[in-house]
Interface confidence: low
């Protein structure tokens, strides 16, 4: 009686055991044995098939036949079958097992194929807890994670399998602990068009941290009231609070606070002055009498009722600049003119505080001639 079987196979291979003997017709029953344990009994000569070999299938195999109850007539030779490992149990390695939050991590599922089976193709899958990472099964034994966060802390492992799914092995679990960096150096900056906070225009309060990882909650406060003006939570080192149209009443002291789950850190207080563009000025003409005559001293007074100082006023006769005058602390400014016959015509003024210029309405002036006849001096203002 002869047992024909391969002596060396790899995991996943099929094993066919063939028991061959003479005068097969006299055999009532036959059996296959492994390590003296009966595997399977047949009523006639049959092959025994191991569909997909595993390491534990290694052992000493033989077959036997029997003709009478409980007695085995013949026993075959013993074939020692060694099932070899197709590839080693994978090992999960990481570029860092304590990565900094927000930084990248590279995972590698390392295994080694048997030198006799280097052409077998494997595919790999990475897991965190019980969740598949990336796009699942891949031909690459590496997985690049562009950024990890504190919630990515946990047990990681990988699986390697033959592309035919016959042999699958998984690595031991490895703990990856994502390190969170506390907030440091919080600052509040003002961003405004032209660098000045101007009434009616947009204002951005930029709260920044020099360091810190993970979700950061930024809050903005007005010192006078202590109330929060707004709150934003995001994965970044800065956040903006926008005031679409600043009011004069928005002037004051502000600070911001940043918190990523450690100790909240507060910025220094920043004073925000709100600059007011000048309103349309009013031009007023004053002379010694009710009427202006040649030789009189005429005072031109220009005043913008609203506007942050300093304000520069320009005085015009028709389109000729007569002169200018400044109001460093606000209010109006005057310009004096000794009248001649040529001074008849339209007068105007312009106010400018760097946030825009505004021009007054024109005021017409009539000067009396040398005959001493006076015409009315009209004053106007808006």
């Amino acid at each position: 009686l002869t047992l024909v079987a391969p002596s060396s196979v790899f995991e996943g291979d099929s094993i066919v055991l063939k028991c061959q003997g003479e005068q097969n017709w006299k055999i009532q029953k036959m059996a296959y044995h492994k390590d003296n344990k009966e595997l399977s009994v047949f009523k006639k000569f049959s092959d025994f098939l191991i569909q997909s070999a595993v390491l534990s299938d290694s052992g000493n195999y033989f077959c036997s036949t029997k003709g009478q109850l409980f007695l085995w007539d013949k026993t075959s030779n013993i074939v020692k079958i060694k099932v070899q490992e197709l590839f080693q149990r994978p090992v999960l390695t990481a570029s860092s097992f304590q990565p900094i939050e927000g930084g990248p991590v590279s995972l590698k599922c390392e295994t080694r194929l048997s030198p006799q089976r280097l052409d077998v193709q494997l595919q790999f899958c990475f897991f965190r807890e019980n969740q598949v990472l990336g796009s699942g099964w891949s031909s690459s034994p590496e997985l690049q994670i562009s950024a990890v966060w504190s919630e990515d802390t946990g047990s990681y492992w990988c699986k390697a399998e033959t592309v035919t799914h016959r042999i699958r092995k998984q690595s031991l679990q490895s703990q990856i602990h994502v390190q969170r960096i506390p907030i440091s150096n919080v600052s509040l900056e003002i961003r405004a068009p032209g660098g000045q906070v101007t009434e009616g225009q947009k204002l951005i309060l930029l709260c920044s941290v020099a360091g810190g990882t993970g979700n950061v909650t930024f809050s903005w406060y007005r010192e006078a009231t202590g109330t929060s003006m707004g709150k934003k939570t995001q994965r970044s080192l800065s956040a903006e609070l926008e005031i679409p149209a600043v009011k004069e009443s928005d002037a004051g002291k502000y600070y911001c606070r940043a918190d990523n789950g450690h100790v909240p850190i507060q910025s220094k207080v920043v004073n925000i002055p709100v600059r007011i563009p000048v309103s349309r000025p009013v031009l007023t003409l004053r002379s010694p009498g009710a009427q202006a005559a040649v030789g009189d001293l005429l005072e031109l007074h220009c005043e913008a009722l609203r506007g942050s100082p300093p304000i520069l006023y320009q005085f015009y006769h028709e389109d000729v600049t007569l002169g200018n005058s400044s109001a460093p602390s606000g209010g109006g400014a005057s310009f004096n003119l000794s009248l001649t016959a040529e001074h008849s015509g339209n007068y105007s003024c312009e106010a400018n505080n760097g946030l825009g210029a505004q021009c007054s309405e024109a005021v017409p002036v009539s000067i009396s001639g040398p005959d001493g006849y006076r015409r009315d001096l009209m004053t106007a203002g808006v």
């Epitope: 996943g12 291979d13 052409d119 077998v120 193709q121 595919q123 031909s139 690459s140 033959t162 592309v163 035919t164 799914h165 016959r166």
Partner: antibody
Framework: QVQLQQSGPELVKPGASVKISCKAS????????MNWVKQSHGKSPEWIGR????????FFNQNFKDKATLTVDKSSNTAHMELLSLTSDDSAVYYC?????????WGQGTTLTVSS | DIVMTQSHKFMSTSVGDRVSITCKAS??????VAWYQQKPGQSPKLLIF???TRHTGVPDRFTGSGSGTDFTLTIGNVQSEDLADYFC?????????FGGGTKLEIK
């Protein structure tokens, strides 16, 4: 050694179907994917699809989804590709190739001519 | 589908020279690229994959490099038997796609 032996050239009429075969030897047939590739004259290869002989699972290039049917016969270690509703555009050399991603072994090719 | 572009349809070189064939992917394919050689009247043969590993029996004058979208097959010390078409292929995502090919001519 690894060999992929393809069936001979075919001359068929438009509208007909044809079945091309690829017999594998020298390796465990169920352990490797079998791919099919089309190469029209003077053109670069075009991946049609692949089949897992172990369980019959198929993956297709959408351009060939309704054109090709992939099957295997494990008892004879043979992969088959049937091409349906043939037109002159289907005239080309068809290759079988072993592998999941890159094709490390190729058949010698089967020339298909579709002509009335 | 990912498009693989081989900008040179033809390249001419002399025996003993060094020549580089390039391939550009329309999107990032990592390192999932292979190179094939096809001699006239023959089926393609795998040269290189991943994208610098030589297939069994491929002479070491064939080398591959690149990642992301740009890949290069370099043949150092070109031999007359290297006259062939060379194709790149991406296997980063289905469907796997091939480049248009570069025909290497020996002067």
């Amino acid at each position: 050694q690894v060999q992929l032996q393809q069936s001979g050239p075919e001359l068929v009429k438009p509208g007909a179907s044809v079945k091309i075969s690829c017999k594998a030897s020298g390796f465990s047939f169920t352990a490797y994917f079998m791919n099919w590739v089309k190469q029209s004259h003077g053109k670069s290869p075009e991946w049609i699809g692949r089949i897992n002989p172990y369980n019959g699972e198929t993956f297709f290039n959408q351009n060939f989804k309704d054109k090709a049917t992939l099957t295997v016969d494990k008892s004879s270690n043979t992969a088959h590709m049937e091409l349906l509703s043939l037109t002159s555009d289907d005239s080309a050399v068809y290759y079988c190739g072993r592998g999941l991603y890159y094709l490390n072994y190729w058949g010698q090719g089967t020339t298909l001519t579709v002509s009335s | 589908d990912i498009v693989m572009t081989q900008s040179h349809k033809f390249m001419s070189t002399s025996v003993g020279d060094r020549v580089s064939i390039t391939c550009k992917a329309s999107q990032d394919v990592g390192t999932a690229v292979a190179w094939y050689q096809q001699k006239p009247g023959q089926s393609p043969k795998l040269l290189i994959f991943w994208p610098s590993t030589r297939h069994t029996g491929v002479p070491d004058r064939f080398t591959g490099s690149g990642s992301g979208t740009d890949f290069t097959l370099t043949i150092g010390n070109v031999q007359s038997e290297d006259l062939a078409d060379y194709f790149c292929q991406q296997f980063s995502s289905l469907p796997h796609t091939f480049g248009g090919g570069t025909k290497l001519e020996i002067k």
